[in-house]
Amino acid sequence: GSERTCCPVNWVEHERSCYWFSRSGKAWADADNYCRLEDAHLVVVTSWEEQKFVQHHIGPVNTWMGLHDQNGPWKWVDGTDYETGFKNWRPEQPDDWYGHGLGGGEDCAHFTDDGRWNDDVCQRPYRWVCETELDKASQEPPLL
C-alpha cells in the first residue's frame, strides 16, 4: 500500500496522527468496527499531550477510546503496552462494576466529562474517536 502523508478530509492532524471525532453514539464494538473500516483504530492515548489534545476536542462528553479488558487484562487495540503506558483513570476506577443491572461487569474504557477515564458497559452508545498514524502504509492499492 501507499504511505499516507496527510489526513483525510474532516480528520484532525496532531503529532503525526490523524483523529476523527464522532458526533453520534455507538456501542464500543460498533465504534471499534467503524474505525477499522476507515483503516484506523479507536484512539490510543500514549502521552500527556495526546490526552490534552483529545480532551480539548471531545469536551465534557463520555467518549470511547481503544482500551478494553474483555479478554482479561486491559489491552490497547493497537498493541501498545498497557502496564507501562500512560493512564488517566478516575479515582477508584476501573472497578468492573456489576451493579448497573445490565449483565456482566464493565470492560470498555471511555473519557468522562473531566477527561479522566472510567470503565463502563461496552454496549452503551457513547461517542468515539478514531486515530490513524501518518507514515503508515494504507490498505489502499497504489495508483498505477
Epitope: Q51, K52, W89, G115
Partner: antibody, heavy 118, light 107 residues
C-alpha cells in the same frame, strides 16, 4: 479546611540528599494528583514534578530528572520528594500543591526552604 | 519545552485602573493556560484555569482570555490587595512551564 503542610527543608551540602514531606488534610488525598514546585530566592516559579492520585504516572522537570523522586503514601495522606545529588541551584522554597485537571494547582502549602551550601 | 513569555515584566498602576498582562507561548497550547497571583513571602494563589475560567472565590474583576499562543489576564478595576506578582502557566505539555512573572506595583 483544606491544608497542605511541607516539612523537611534545611541546609545541606552539595552532593547530599534530603527528603521533603507534604502532609495533606481536609480533602480526600487519594483522589488528587500532587505537584512539587520551587522558587529560588528572588526568582519565579519552577515546576518540579507531578504524581497521579494513584501513582500511575510521574513526570519531572529536566533539571531534576534522575536526581529527584516524587512519591506518595495515600494511607498517610503524605506526599514526598526525595532529593539526591543536590546542587547549589536547587536552593529554593519548595511548595507542594494539589493538582486540578492535569497541571493546574488549586491548593498550595506554605513552602519549606532548602539551602544547598558548603 | 514550551517557553512562556510574559509582558510587561513590571508595571505601575493606580487603584481603579484597568490592568492587562500578556502571556505568549512558544507553541500552540490550545487553551491550557492558568494564571496565579503571588504576594511577598506567600504561596501562589490560583486565579484562572483553561485560559478563561475563574477559580471559585476569585473576584469577578479578574478575567482571562486567549487561545493558541496569546493570552491575557485583565483586572478591570485594580484594588489595593491586587498589588502582587502574576504568573501564567501552561499545562498542555510536560515539563509544565511558568512565565517569568509580571509585578504589579503601586504608582
Amino acid at each position: 479546611q483544606v491544608q497542605l503542610v511541607e516539612s523537611g527543608g534545611g541546609v545541606v551540602q552539595p552532593g547530599r540528599s534530603l527528603r521533603l514531606s507534604c502532609a495533606a488534610s481536609g480533602f480526600t488525598f487519594s483522589s488528587f494528583g500532587m505537584h512539587w514546585v520551587r522558587q529560588a530566592p528572588g526568582k519565579g516559579l519552577e515546576w518540579v514534578a507531578i504524581i497521579w492520585h494513584d501513582g500511575s504516572n510521574k513526570y519531572y522537570a529536566d533539571s531534576v530528572k534522575g536526581r529527584f523522586t516524587i512519591s506518595r503514601d495515600n494511607s498517610k495522606n503524605t506526599l514526598y520528594l526525595q532529593m539526591s545529588s543536590l546542587r547549589a541551584e536547587d536552593t529554593a522554597v519548595y511548595y507542594c500543591a494539589r493538582d486540578l485537571s492535569m497541571g493546574g494547582m488549586d491548593v498550595w502549602g506554605q513552602g519549606t526552604t532548602v539551602t544547598v551550601s558548603s | 519545552d514550551i517557553q512562556m513569555t510574559q509582558s510587561p515584566s513590571s508595571l505601575s498602576a493606580s487603584v481603579g485602573d484597568r490592568v492587562t498582562i500578556a502571556c505568549r507561548a512558544s507553541q500552540n497550547i490550545i487553551s491550557y493556560l492558568n494564571w496565579y497571583q503571588q504576594k511577598p513571602g506567600k504561596a501562589p494563589k490560583f486565579l484562572i484555569y483553561t485560559a478563561s475560567s475563574l477559580q471559585s472565590g476569585v473576584p469577578s474583576r479578574f478575567s482571562g482570555s486567549g487561545s493558541g499562543t496569546d493570552f491575557t489576564l485583565t483586572i478591570s478595576s485594580l484594588q489595593p490587595e491586587d498589588f502582587a506578582i502574576y504568573y501564567c502557566q501552561q499545562t498542555y505539555s510536560t515539563p509544565l512551564t511558568f512565565g517569568g512573572g509580571t509585578k504589579v506595583e503601586i504608582k
